[in-house]
Amino acid sequence: TPTTLASHSTKTDASSTHHSSVPPLTSSNHSTSPQLSTGVSFFFLSFHISNLQFNSSLEDPSTDYYQELQRDISEMFLQIYKQGGFLGLSNIKFRPGSVVVQLTLAFREGTINVHDVETQFNQYKTEAASRYNLTISDVSVSDVPFPFSAQSGAGVPG
């Protein structure tokens, strides 16, 4: 599944049907390049964009509407979490209900928890409305257990 990396400014199309994939972490340009041995934390995030309407264009990744919305959302998340331990996002899906957005966020393990993922997204909602003209509501964040994610032991220095 194509992925938006925190270290890249260019965006690629994301399938609306595939499940979340592991970002290719070795592409990251962080000073301490994250490797799978360090571990990755995944979070599933969904939210409503209440000022947009869902239509069939959001089921087709080749349409302008799909690509523009995906680009805005990808840029928004790169703004919210910047870099630090943010590795990228994948598996953006659009659903009916105004527009419901579902995606998976990947972070360097041990650098953030589910509460702070949600907090920082909620803190950015006002800016998202002005910068991207997206009115965001009904934010929900949950942990995604991945069997290959290294178990938390000693913390990653921050």
């Epitope: 000073s31 910047k82 630090g84 953030i112 509460h115 702070d116 920082q120 220095p157 921050g158």
Partner: antibody, heavy 119, light 107 residues
């Protein structure tokens, strides 16, 4: 290894300004938030604000807005905090501290800079 | 603004004793609490992140627990080198805030 080295102690007169530096090494300066924390003598810790050197994005504690200005120089991997219109209450040790995100914890701290405001 | 209240303000213990510090948040913050140790004339040092996650290089006698509004930092067997101030910090909301601190003294 990650290092944050702050500038030396300053003595300033009320109403003046001071600019403190925090020179970093051992990591990609642009990719992490730099925070500033105040500690008055014998008192606790108070978060002033933060800057993301990659694009200059800043967040401030409302209490310090207008009095503290955060900047960063990517070429020298140095963060700065300027405090203006100094009053006696600004007498404190100021720390820089690195974090992964806007809201986070601080594993790396500078050694602190004592600013004394006295006439 | 989230207010963090630490108790007690001072704690006096004998070496090898178990000590517990508490931090209470003015509203629920999940597990977004972090603990620091600050020795005299030094910078704070991160001990525990996200309420209970250990930090590389920090002695195993330090542990944390709690969620919601009530959190604890425990030192299982106090050593003389643990004389310091201990602060909690929340990252659940802006502005980031710290507790007022607890001073640990050795009898």
């Amino acid at each position: 290894q990650v290092q944050l080295v702050q500038s030396g102690a300053e003595v300033k007169k009320p109403g003046s300004s001071v600019k403190i530096s925090c020179k970093t090494s051992g990591y990609a300066f642009s990719n992490f938030w730099m925070n500033w924390v105040k500690q008055r003598p014998g008192q606790g810790l108070e978060w002033i604000g933060q800057i993301y050197p990659g694009d200059g994005d800043t967040n401030y504690n409302g209490k310090f807005k207008g009095r503290a200005t955060l900047t960063a120089d990517k070429s020298s991997s140095t963060a700065y905090m300027e405090l203006s219109s100094l009053r006696s209450e600004a007498t404190a040790v100021y720390f820089c501290a690195r974090s992964y995100y806007r809201s986070a914890w601080f594993a790396y701290w500078g050694q602190g800079t004592l600013v004394t405001v006295s006439s | 603004e989230i207010l963090l209240t630490q108790s007690p303000d001072f704690q006096s213990v004998t070496p090898k004793e178990k000590v517990t510090f508490t931090c209470r948040a003015s509203q629920s913050i999940g597990t977004s609490i972090h603990w620091y140790q600050q020795k005299p004339n030094q910078s704070p040092k991160l001990l525990i992140k996200y309420a209970s996650e250990s930090i590389s290089g920090v002695p195993s006698r330090f542990s944390g627990s709690g969620s919601g509004t009530d959190f604890t930092l425990t030192i299982n067997s106090v050593e003389s080198e643990d004389i310091a101030d201990y602060y909690c910090q929340q990252s659940n909301n802006w502005p980031l805030t710290f507790g007022q601190g607890t001073k640990l003294e050795i009898k």
